[in-house]
Each structure stands twice: as structure tokens, then as C-alpha cells.
Interface confidence: medium
Amino acid sequence: FVRTKIDTTENLLNTEVHSSPAQRWSMQVPPEVSAEAGDAAVLPCTFTHPHRHYDGPLTAIWRAGEPYAGPQVFRCAAARGSELCQTALSLHGRFRLLGNPRRNDLSLRVERLALADDRRYFCRVEFAGDVHDRYESRHGVRLHVTAAPRIVNISVLPSPAHAFRALCTAEGEPPPALAWSGPALGNSLAAVRSPREGHGHLVTAELPALTHDGRYTCTAANSLGRSEASVYLFRFHGASGAST
């Protein structure tokens, strides 16, 4: 028993309409869906179209990044008269159609969310029978993935004049604040680099000069939690090496 829930009004923030006789092409998506890394999220997408009682072949597509040209993350096809949309592509097996395209519903579920899934997604439907037509969401739905901090790298590196520096890189959303603590440091924000272009969830903090032997701890914190990791510096005094 299928229940259809289509709002044909055009007052949604992200309702996109293409004029046509009778019913019009339109797509309804929310501006944003938020979920935490590791969870599953639903990307709602419903549509209306001008082709009454169309039951020919159709294809449902979701793409990421940009409309019309972005890479496909999900695609399924339904044969004439069939309510089953057979999955042809599900990137990493994590995308699953929840909606019934025959009931004007392309809603998608994304499983095991990762920070890399934080982008905009666009739904598209194609008719390919007696009627040839297609329509795609232009604004899409932003999937906002949040995550507690995770320290992805912590290391001690040599620097000029037999000195050493420490680097700590963490990821999270919101981007975590980093702090170093260690011998004669107290609590220091050190030199925190802004998230790198294309790596918006990564933050790096550098301790430019380690002046004392001992344990140096990097703490990453955001509104969802905190994480810490440590490195040890022990120099062989009178020699130029170090053990970390």
C-alpha cells in the first residue's frame, strides 16, 4: 500500500518550476539536511510533471557537487509499468532509493555518512518512452555532515638548526579548535592554520620550536566532542638525533 505525499504548491524555498501546459514540471527539495557522521540521512525530493498517467520507462538519478554535470552517486531504472526502480549505480553501496518514482518521489537515503559526503546533491528524473522528457533540481539539497573531532595526524619533524617542530592535524565539523600542551608550554593555541582549500574540515596547528624534552599533547575540540593525542620528544643530548 503506497501513500503518496506530494505538495504541488509552489511556495517551497527550493521548489523549481518549468512552465508547461496542464501540470508543470517542478521539484521540491529542502534547502539543507543535517546529520552526523556515521548516521544515515534522507535527502527528500518530490516532483510534479505535465505527462498525465505516464507509465513508460524512467530513470531516477542523483548527482553530487553541481547540477547537470556533477558525478552521479545513484541511478536506477524502472521498466514500463513497473514500480520497482532497479539500482544501476550506488556509489560505495551507500545510496538507496526510498521514494517511488512512479509516485513522483525520488527521495534517497545515504548510509554511514562521512565528512566527505558534505556537499550539495541534485535529483533528476528522465522519461524515455512514448514521451521523452527530463527534469533536474537546479538548487539541490545541501547535505551538512557534522562530526566530533578526530586527530588524523600528529608528528614531530626536524627543523633548521637542530631544532624540532610539532604538527597536529584534526578533522571535524564544525572545524575543531586545536590546542597544544607540553613542557613549559602551558596551554597554547600555537600556530593554527585555517582549513585548507578543498579540505574544509581539516585544521592544522604547529608548534614551531620544541624547547624541552617530554610529552606534547594536541587537543581538538568542537561542539560535538573532543579528542587528544600525544607525541614524545627525547633528544640524545650531545648528539643531533631525537627519539619521538
Epitope: 503506497v2 503518496t4 526510498l98 521514494g99 537515503r109
Partner: antibody, heavy 123, light 107 residues
Framework: QVQLQESGPGLVKPSETLSLTCTVS????????VHWVRQPPGKGLEWIVL???????TYNSALKSRVTISKDTSKNQVSLKLSSVTAADTAVYYC?????????????????WGQGTLVTVSS | DIQMTQSPSSLSASVGDRVTITCKAS??????LAWYQQKPGKVPKLLIS???SLETGVPSRFSGSGSGTDYTLTISSLQPEDVATYYC?????????FGGGTKVEIK
Amino acid sequence: QVQLQESGPGLVKPSETLSLTCTVSGFSLSNYGVHWVRQPPGKGLEWIVLIWSDGSTTYNSALKSRVTISKDTSKNQVSLKLSSVTAADTAVYYCARHPYDDYSGYYYTMDYWGQGTLVTVSS
Amino acid sequence: DIQMTQSPSSLSASVGDRVTITCKASDHINNWLAWYQQKPGKVPKLLISGATSLETGVPSRFSGSGSGTDYTLTISSLQPEDVATYYCQQYWSSPLTFGGGTKVEIK
């Protein structure tokens, strides 16, 4: 017929972990998901978490840091754990069936509910 | 999060009266709205999903309407067995959120 039954201790001490089990019959956890919803005495309903038929989870982010949900399909059971409880967690806790996932068109409604179990947090 | 505001919070009407409960969402929810009935001391029961679709076995005196952000539950002719608290719930966006409830009593 479809039935859901919550069970667990009625009294939990502050800072401890609340553990509840939902035992279902009349349907398979392989095909249907389960929600947990709570209702403080005399107040409204608050959604906690959904475990989908394939074991994926969707949480209320306001509670996620304290919530753990799991299921044992062979035993027809779903368990909920809520850590570090306070008096504000005193409520009737319900499990409810999430309709069949695929093509249902209503992804987050609850078509059958358990009778609920009152959990009081007090020392 | 999408907030759901129900009004009135309580009402008293006579048997046979037409009763209207409204639910306003803080953002568009595209008709992805459910109505539940909770009788005193009982569990919630799904009445309507998709803003307008009546569940099997629910009396036809119950109906739902609305679109965008504004939705309505109507009981065309109030019966004694309709004494309950009614909740709306949106499922367009996670987390799922409920209205505060409307308590319906008989005069």
C-alpha cells in the same frame, strides 16, 4: 498481529545508564525499522532515534552523544541505552514501528506503538 | 530543527461540534506531516500521514488539510470517544519534531 513491548528497569540513578529493550512480534526487524520516542510526565513527545531495517541509524543530534541503539533480528529485539541520565530524562519511553522502508513515501512516521515504559531517574 | 507549533493547546466542545486544530511549521515541510491521537493513559495512534491520507480504520470524521507550513486536523462531528490529546509531527527533515499537543475535551 503487530505488537511492540518495552521492558527495562523503572528506576535509574542519576549519572547511570538507562537500558531498555523493545521486543516485537507480528513483523520482522529485517523489513521494518524501529523508533524510540519519549514523553516526560504530562508533557509532549520527543523523538530519540530510528534504527532502519538494515541496521543503519538516524539520531536526534540533541541526544546522540548519550544514545546507543542496536538490534538482534533473530531475537526480535531492539535495545536502547541512554547514558549519564538526569532527572530530565524521566519519561515514558516508547518504541514504535517504522513503516517498510522502500517506496513507502512516509519515511519517518510511526504506525504501531508499544505500550510504553515509565523510567524514573532518582537517587 | 523544524519547530512545530500547535494551537490551541486545549479546547472544549460539545458532542457533534466541528473541531479544528492547527499546526504551523517553522519551515516548509512539503506535506510530510502526520497527526497522532493519544487518549488518556494510552499510546499514540497514527491517524493521518502525508497531511491528508487517513490511516486504515480511522473514522471518516477525521480529515487533514494544508500545505507549505500550515496544516489543519478537523473532526467534523466530535464524539465522546474523541477525547484525547492530538499531536502533529513533521518528517520532512530530521530530527523528527512534534507539536506541543492539543487537548480536546467534551463540554
